[in-house]
Structures are given as C-alpha cells and as structure tokens.
C-alpha cells in the first residue's frame, strides 16, 4: 500500500501530502476512510483538501484516522493512504518518541539541522529553534532558511531540537512545531579544496627522447576518510583512457596518509619510449573532490645531452 504516517499536535497546523504522486494537472480527491466521507475543498472548513495536500487548520485530536487520496488522471486512478495521528500537547518539556522525526547527526564541520516537513507549509523566516525546550541563544546558533546551523559543534550539542514556525493561510496564522534528535559524531576528519603538491603549476619537465619518463600527480584533500577524492591525468584536455596512445598510461600510486593525518593520492603517468611529438602535448594533473577541481599543467622539454668535454 502507498501509506504514510503523519502526526501533529492539537491546535497546530498540520499539512499532509498524498503519498501517491501525480502531475499538478491531475485531480486529487480526499476521503475520510472510516466513513468514506469526502473531504471538502472549501477553505472555510477547518479540515480541507487542496490538491495533493490535506490541511488541518488547526488540527484536533478527533481528526486522527486514515485518510484516502485518489489521484485521478484521464487514463488511471492511483490511491494512497495517510495515517494521521493528532496528539494532545504535553504539559511538560519532554517530547515523546512518537512525536520525533528522524534523527540527524552532525560533526564539527557539518552541523545543519533541517526543520522537518517545513516544505509543505507557507512560512516566512525566521524559524525559531529550541533545544530541550530552551530557546537557542548565542552567536553559535544561526537560523538559516529552513535549517539551523551550529558553529563549532561539541558533544554537548546533542539533544532534541524543535523548530517552530508560523503557517499562513489566507491571512490566518497557525503555529507549527517539529522535533528531531541531533547526535554529534566524534569526527576529527575534514575535507578541503584539493591541494596539488606536485607537479608545480606550469612546470617544465626534462625528458630524454627514446627513454621512459614518469610524471607524478600528487594531491591532498583533507584529513581522515574522504567521500570523494580523485587524481587523474589528461592529455591536451582529453582523458588518458580516451586519448588512444598505448605508450602513455596512468597508474594509481599509493594512497598516502601523512603523519599529520592528511589524506593524499598519487597518480603516476608513465610515458614509454618518449617521442618528439610527446613534447608538443599539454599534460594536466587534475585533483577532484566535492569542493571542486584543481588543475596543474606540465609540459615536457628535451633534456640536452650532457657535454663530456674535459
């Protein structure tokens, strides 16, 4: 079944989306499943349907139950079910598990807590945020769009975070709150824009015609485990595997983790039997991660034979 659990608090707004997707042009009919009674679309009603959305403005405990939505297109009907539970407001600060949205985890470098379900509502910034029922104050906390950013996250920042906002419907305001747990990962690692250690930008590498030559592309990406980190060589702006010169191959070197903990990668470009035409190519060392891409260019030059005159 296409079924979705939704919950809210009495006297707050609750908006539920039909679990079945459809084009905006499709008609969506809503019914209260127990009685098969159609939900009205007139906005003067406290509970009304608005396309894919079912709106409780505000919700009451008696609204709890299963609601059926039918998405109607010219060629098919799709049925979904919304299992709605409205709870009485707690007198104490404790938020019970059944009112909690999914737990999110953060670290020193990534500490965004998104306000659950907010995308369904017509709200305006700023959001109010509370931790364990206390309003968040201080420069470490920044309410930004639909999420909270915590600077310099510490293990003590773990806890239950509640966002509170106002939904506006035809000039009437309704309060909405949503709570989720935040856990802090003890993560010493971090990621930064790739730093290419070798070759230097616009380096000229001397090679001997007829001999083999190696170029090493070495880059560091941060500390600890990296989500995405890669180094590669390109020839005249084309990937080695697409360039089609079997004499020139790249070979992954050692994954390096230096004593300072930096995560680095090597890629060795091996040129067998260097030819004159190799001197005309542009060799690009590329380092890529989720921050972006950095490129260093190398050119080859002929090594002059050593003069052995005494």
């Amino acid at each position: 079944k296409f079924s979705k659990q939704s919950w809210g608090l009495e006297n707050e707004a609750l908006i539920v989306r039909c679990p079945r997707q459809g084009k905006p042009s499709y008609t969506v009919d809503w019914y209260y499943s127990q009685t098969n009674k159609s939900i009205p679309t007139q906005e003067r009603n406290r509970v009304f349907a608005s396309g894919q959305l079912l709106k409780f403005l505000p919700a009451a405990v008696a609204d709890s139950g299963i609601y059926t939505c039918i998405v109607r297109s010219p060629t098919f009907n799709r049925t979904g079910y919304a299992n709605v539970t409205i709870y009485k407001k707690q007198s104490d600060c404790n938020v019970p598990d059944y009112l909690m949205y999914s737990t999110v985890s953060g670290s020193e470098k990534n500490s965004k807590i998104y306000c659950p379900t907010i995308d369904l509502y017509n709200w305006t910034a700023p959001l109010e945020w509370f931790k364990n029922c206390q309003a968040l104050q201080g420069s470490r906390y920044r309410a930004h769009k639909s999420f909270l950013v915590i600077d310099n996250v510490m293990t003590e920042d773990a806890g239950d975070y509640t966002c509170k906002f106002i939904h506006n419907e035809n000039g009437a305001n309704y309060s909405v709150t949503a709570t989720r747990s935040f856990t802090v990962k003890d993560e010493q690692g971090f990621s930064l824009f790739p730093v290419i250690g070798a070759p230097a930008q616009n380096e000229i590498k001397e090679v001997e015609i007829g001999k083999n030559a190696n170029l090493t592309c070495s880059a560091c990406f941060g500390k600890g485990t990296q989500f995405l980190a890669a180094v590669l060589w390109q020839l005249n702006g084309t990937k080695i595997t697409d360039f089609g010169e079997p004499r020139i191959q790249q070979e992954e070197g050692q994954n390096q983790s230096f004593s300072n903990g930096l995560a680095c990668l090597d890629m060795v470009l091996r040129i067998a039997d260097v030819k004159e035409e190799d001197l005309l190519l542009q060799y690009d060392c590329l380092a890529l991660n989720l921050h972006g891409l950095r490129r260093h260019t190398v050119r080859l030059s002929r090594k002059n034979p050593i003069d052995h005159h005494s």
Partner: nanobody
Framework: EVQLVESGGGLVQPGGSLRLSCAAS????????MGWFRQAPGKEREFVAV???????KYADSVKGRFTISADNSKNTAYLQMNSLKPEDTAVYYC???????????????WGQGTLVTVSS
C-alpha cells in the same frame, strides 16, 4: 559551459531498477568528469557517483554495489544504473559535469535540471 539534460526518472517499487541518462551538449565531454548527485526532500544535495574515466568510478557508501555509473563518449551521455532501489533512494537526481578551468569550485560545476526518482510500494 556544458548543457546537461537528465531523463529516466520515475516511480519504481522497492527492489526495482531504473536507468538515468544525462546527455551533455558541446564537445567537451572527453575532458569532463561526470557525476550524479541527489537531493531528498528537506535534505542537502549529496554525492552519489562520479566517473573519472572509463576505468575509474567512485561511489557514495550508501549506493555501492547497487548503482553503476558509466559513460558513452560517442553519445556524449552519462548513465546511472540503479538496482535494488530502496525508499531512501527517493530524491531528485542531478547530473553534474566539471572540467575546463584551472580551479572549479563545486558551485561552478555545470548542473542539469534534475529528474525525480520515487521508490515506493
């Protein structure tokens, strides 16, 4: 700038498969690193997979063994084969391309408009 157009999204049951395509305009495809990212409702855009060249691919831990990224140079197209789909794979999937300049920040990657993948029974 590379223009990217994704296709292949849709509704699929858990355990099912989908194949996303990303067609790239222009002749920069051979110098471009192609990737797929996704954004679930209320969450940040996250990395899914990248194809560095025909022999080198990288995947997010959450999709390893289930998703396969590939590219067809002759068609200037990248693909994401998604198998054993789970409800948590539901998201808008974006194709991305990076190449060209000496330094390119993540915000300067070229992005497609996205294609919605819904995994639900």
């Amino acid at each position: 700038e590379v223009q990217l157009v994704e296709s292949g999204g849709g509704l699929v049951q858990p355990g099912g498969s989908l194949r996303l395509s990303c067609a790239a305009s222009g002749n920069a495809f051979r110098s471009t690193v192609m990737g797929w990212f996704r954004q679930a409702p209320g969450k940040e855009r996250e990395f899914v997979a990248v194809i560095i060249d025909s022999r080198t691919t990288k995947y997010a831990d959450s999709v390893k063994g289930r998703f396969t990224i590939s590219a067809d140079n002759s068609k200037n197209t990248a693909y994401l084969q998604m198998n054993s789909l789970k409800p948590e794979d539901t998201a808008v999937y974006y194709c991305a391309a990076v190449g060209g300049a000496t330094t390119v920040t993540a915000s300067e990657w070229d992005w497609g408009q996205g294609t919605l993948v819904t995994v639900s029974s």
